[in-house]
């Protein structure tokens, strides 16, 4: 349409820009492998790397695994987004006693107020129920059946979450971990168990602090101990260790008290897209066939991409490109165009850069 022409002409001759007829503006064309953060990018900072599914781009521009909320006692609060992790919280009826980055290392059931006490503040995902003495004139013989189950000798302002002790199974609060199905489903409706010598789950100045060995008075060797599969990061927070559960990953170093598990690509594969303590995408070592060529592209990021040879050229099989990562080979007849979800595909010409996904299918490198 003629009215578009004057605007469109202003973009011509500048390969780094294009004219969007819909918004009638010149827009910056993000380099290959980077993706726009707005509909009409204006500058290079409007283009970012796109991570694999279940990874997000952290502040340092690294693809980092989103935490998982797969434990029985956790629910997803916010989903994994391109630039922020999934956030997990304790499921309804439970509160977090030991927090972790974007998650909770240990959840307990909300306590039930004992006889003579009523709920002052109901429990939330972050806080336990807070109890207060029943108002004068309200019979301790139960203002509400929820708040009065059995007689109690003392009154406490805060209901204590108490774990099941070996001798009893009537406890109201119990830490729940991933492997255990919630046997205490109805426990939040029960009364608390008699105080036991165990300190686990008791309110303290720092729930989650527990000595790594018996802690003598004045000893400096009492450090915070995280739940299994969590480690203590540099900031002193319990952080989930990465998982190596993907088919193409193996554990390189285990999850320790002060360091994450690290994963690496299983034998026969090489990391094409790195991630913190892991690899976001593993690709098979190349098997150089007569009709393929491996060639690193000059890209804005370190990921290696590969292209099929121009027709009629002799292959030049180079198993270790400049960045030291071995590329995957691709067949020119199998080039596919896909997004980062690698689901439905469109063919692309043989000059388009492709890599192999962890499923072995050719995938156009999305960073």
């Amino acid at each position: 349409f003629p009215q578009d022409r004057p605007f469109e002409d202003t973009c011509h001759g500048n390969p780094s820009h294009y004219y969007d007829k819909a918004v009638r503006r010149c827009c910056y064309r993000c380099p290959m492998g980077l993706f726009p953060t707005q509909q009409c990018p204006q500058r290079p900072t409007d283009c970012r790397k796109q991570c694999e599914p279940d990874y997000y781009l952290d502040e340092a521009d690294r693809c980092t695994a989103c935490v998982t909320c797969s434990r029985d006692d956790l629910v997803e609060k916010t989903p994994c987004a391109w630039n922020s992790s999934r956030v997990c919280e304790c499921r309804p009826g439970m509160f977090c006693s030991t927090s972790a980055v974007n998650s909770c290392a240990r959840c307990f059931f909300h306590s039930v107020c004992p006889a003579g006490m009523i709920v002052k503040f109901p429990g939330t995902a972050q806080k336990n129920t807070v109890c207060e003495p029943a108002s004068p004139g309200v019979s301790p013989a139960c203002a509400s059946p929820e708040n009065c189950k059995e007689p109690s000798s003392g009154t406490i302002p805060q209901a204590k979450p108490t774990p099941v002790s070996p001798a009893t199974s009537s406890a109201s609060t119990m830490p729940v971990r991933g492997g255990t199905r919630l046997a205490q489903e109805a426990a939040s409706k029960l009364t608390r168990a008699p105080d036991s010598p165990s300190s686990v789950g008791r309110p303290s100045s720092d729930p989650g602090l527990s000595p790594t060995q018996p802690c003598p008075e004045g000893s400096g060797d009492c450090r915070k101990q995280c739940e299994p599969d969590y480690y203590l990061d540099e900031a002193g927070r319990c952080t989930a260790c990465v998982s190596c559960s993907r088919d193409d990953l193996v554990e390189k170093t285990p999850c320790a008290w002060n360091s994450s598990r690290t994963c690496e690509c299983r034998p026969g594969m090489i990391c094409a897209t790195s991630a913190t303590n892991s690899c976001a995408r593993c690709v098979p070592y190349p098997i150089c066939a007569a009709e393929t060529v491996t060639k690193p592209q000059d890209m804005a990021e370190k990921d290696t991409t590969f292209e099929a040879p121009p027709l009629g050229t002799q292959p030049d099989c180079n198993p270790t490109p400049e960045n030291g990562e071995a590329p995957a080979s691709t067949s020119p007849t199998q080039s596919l165009l896909v997004d980062s979800q690698a689901s439905k595909t469109l063919p692309i010409p043989t000059s388009a850069p492709v890599a192999l996904s962890s499923t072995g299918k050719p995938v156009l490198d999305a960073g």
Epitope: F35, N83, V338, D339, L346, A366
Partner: nanobody, 123 residues
Framework: QVKLVESGGGSVQAGGSLRLSCAAS????????MGWFRQAPGKEREWVAR????????YYADSVKGRFTISQDNAKNTVYLQMNSLRPEDTAMYDC????????????????WGQGTQVTVSS
């Protein structure tokens, strides 16, 4: 160089159907979108529909929802717009556009455009 070629336009009676095609050649980015816009004489260009070619997710303007269907043929690198129950107000030049999904959004860039195909619906 990316090239988009539209076809399938023509004249049709109100209530009739047409199927537009947009064939893409040359390099197309991954995580991409292909979509249709239309512009009637003297009016603003209007977005009609788009498909995220990787996931297959489809989106439509309210004015065409339930009447138009966008689809793709992976083998032919082609996107189609099936237009049913056409109305006189659907008369316009239909343009195909291609670009990339915007991170964290369902909108797309429109980096490449075809030359357009005319659709005329008479009452």
């Amino acid at each position: 160089q990316v090239k988009l070629v539209e076809s399938g336009g023509g004249s049709v009676q109100a209530g009739g159907s047409l199927r537009l095609s947009c064939a893409a050649s040359g390099y197309i980015y991954s995580s991409n979108c292909m979509g249709w816009f239309r512009q009637a004489p003297g009016k603003e260009r209007e977005w009609v529909a788009r498909i995220h070619t990787g996931s297959g997710s489809t989106y439509y303007a309210d004015s065409v929802k339930g009447r138009f269907t966008i689809s793709q043929d992976n083998a032919k690198n082609t996107v189609y717009l099936q237009m049913n129950s056409l109305r006189p107000e659907d008369t316009a030049m239909y343009d195909c556009a291609a670009g990339r999904v915007v991170l964290g959004a369902v909108v797309c860039t429109n980096e490449y455009w075809g030359q357009g195909t005319q659709v005329t619906v008479s009452s």
